[in-house]
């Protein structure tokens, strides 16, 4: 949602967290601002304190409950407001009617581990974190491998168009250090975006056996 020179963007992690970023052109005085969440069909409401992440943007996480609790559904609409203190009052700086399952960004995949490694291949698995059971198998993944002398940005993206929590990396160089990352995205939601990349998993391929190709 955009109000004048202000931008207010929020994502739902599909379980019990709404993360918001509010940016505003022109520095505000030292004032306290927060995000208020008012669901249309729930008895609870929630607030988080916006904290600066750069000169003109602030962020906060609305914790709606226990990490794996299903706090919202596809029919919920949550009114999200940015409120800033002026005098003794709060001023509405930005507002949006937020449809959680149209604005999804899952948590980064976790528990990355090497299942099996060879000279030219490596099998890696991972788990998804705090993802709603509503998705069933309707998830996709992107993975990337960091080779020596390259940057993450240069790494080609490998796309997994189904809920597959493992990958077999091929055509690797023997006895070489690599790093691997993966991210996840539900197929649902007009404004849904990729999760952050997972923590990188470092692994090393096996050295080639002398006089023998494995």
């Amino acid at each position: 949602a955009v109000n004048g020179t202000s931008q207010f963007t929020c994502f739902y992690n599909s379980r019990a967290n709404i993360s918001c970023v509010w940016s505003q052109d022109g520095a505000l005085q030292d004032t306290s601002c927060q995000v208020h969440a008012w669901p249309d069909r729930r008895r609870w409401n929630q607030t988080c304190e916006l904290l600066p992440v750069s000169q003109a943007s602030w962020a906060c996480n609305l914790i709606l409950g226990a990490p794996d609790s299903q706090k919202l559904t596809t029919v919920d609409i949550v009114t999200l407001r940015v409120l800033c203190r002026e005098g003794v009052r709060w001023r509405v700086m930005a507002i949006q009617d937020f449809k959680p399952f149209e604005n999804l960004r899952l948590m980064a995949p976790i528990s990355l581990q090497v299942v099996h490694v060879e000279t030219h291949r490596c099998n890696i698995s991972w788990e998804i974190s705090q993802a709603s059971h509503y998705f069933e198998r309707h998830l996709e993944f992107e993975a990337r491998t960091l080779s020596p002398g390259h940057t993450w940005e240069e790494a080609p993206l490998l796309t997994l168009k189904q809920k597959q929590e493992w990958i077999c990396l091929e055509t690797l160089t023997p006895d070489t250090q690599y790093e691997f990352q993966v991210r996840v995205k539900p197929l649902q939601g007009e404004f849904t975006t990729w999760s952050p990349w997972s923590q990188p998993l470092a692994f090393r391929t096996k050295p080639a056996a002398l006089g023998k190709d494995t």
Partner: antibody, heavy 121, light 112 residues
Framework: EVQLVQSGAEVKKPGASVKVSCKAS????????ISWVRQATGQGLEWMGE????????YYNEMFKGRVTMTRDTSISTAYMELSSLRSEDTAVYYC??????????????WGQGTTVTVSS | DVVMTQSPLSLPVTLGQPASISCRSS???????????LEWFQQRPGQSPRLLIY???NRFSGVPDRFSGSGSGTDFTLKISRVEAEDVGVYYC?????????FGGGTKVEIK
Amino acid sequence: EVQLVQSGAEVKKPGASVKVSCKASGYTFTDYVISWVRQATGQGLEWMGEIYPGDGNTYYNEMFKGRVTMTRDTSISTAYMELSSLRSEDTAVYYCARGSYTYDNYAMDFWGQGTTVTVSS
Amino acid sequence: DVVMTQSPLSLPVTLGQPASISCRSSQNIVHSNAQTYLEWFQQRPGQSPRLLIYKVSNRFSGVPDRFSGSGSGTDFTLKISRVEAEDVGVYYCFQGSHIPWTFGGGTKVEIK
């Protein structure tokens, strides 16, 4: 029905203090702000500041800082405005007015009937 | 502080005729949230002020539709389409965009 009932007229000597009360009814006192506005005889309106009864937080117009004190007693849904070091220019009608804690639409919707304060030696 | 200047100071009108009051602010009163907190109050003789219009053009509940507000930036207008006897009094504009909030000096509407 929302009502703000203010205390009666006061006559004070220069240098003295005056304390005006504003009793609220018809709504939850701690959910709204109470603003104070004054109107000198034949003059316009001047916003003095406000108090949020929910936590007692106050904000004063710079013009009155150091001379004005706003307080509240939630047990009797009453807000108070005290003005000290009175001078003849403080002769005015003092109004309390209700305002939304979240300023989304308007500053003040319901007003008290006003309290006349006369400063004279 | 934002200075609000109203004109005219006095406005004699004929019953049933339109009336227009101008309010000019010394600086732009668009708040950083892109809203303009310009309000109009009516003060009938011997009474407290009463909210008529908020956010430039929105009528407060119970306000007759003969009252309308318009304007933007620094120039605002309150119009009464057909003046009635009960409209006599002083009208004040008010800005709530920049603290300290300030009122205009008032315009006295009287019947000719």
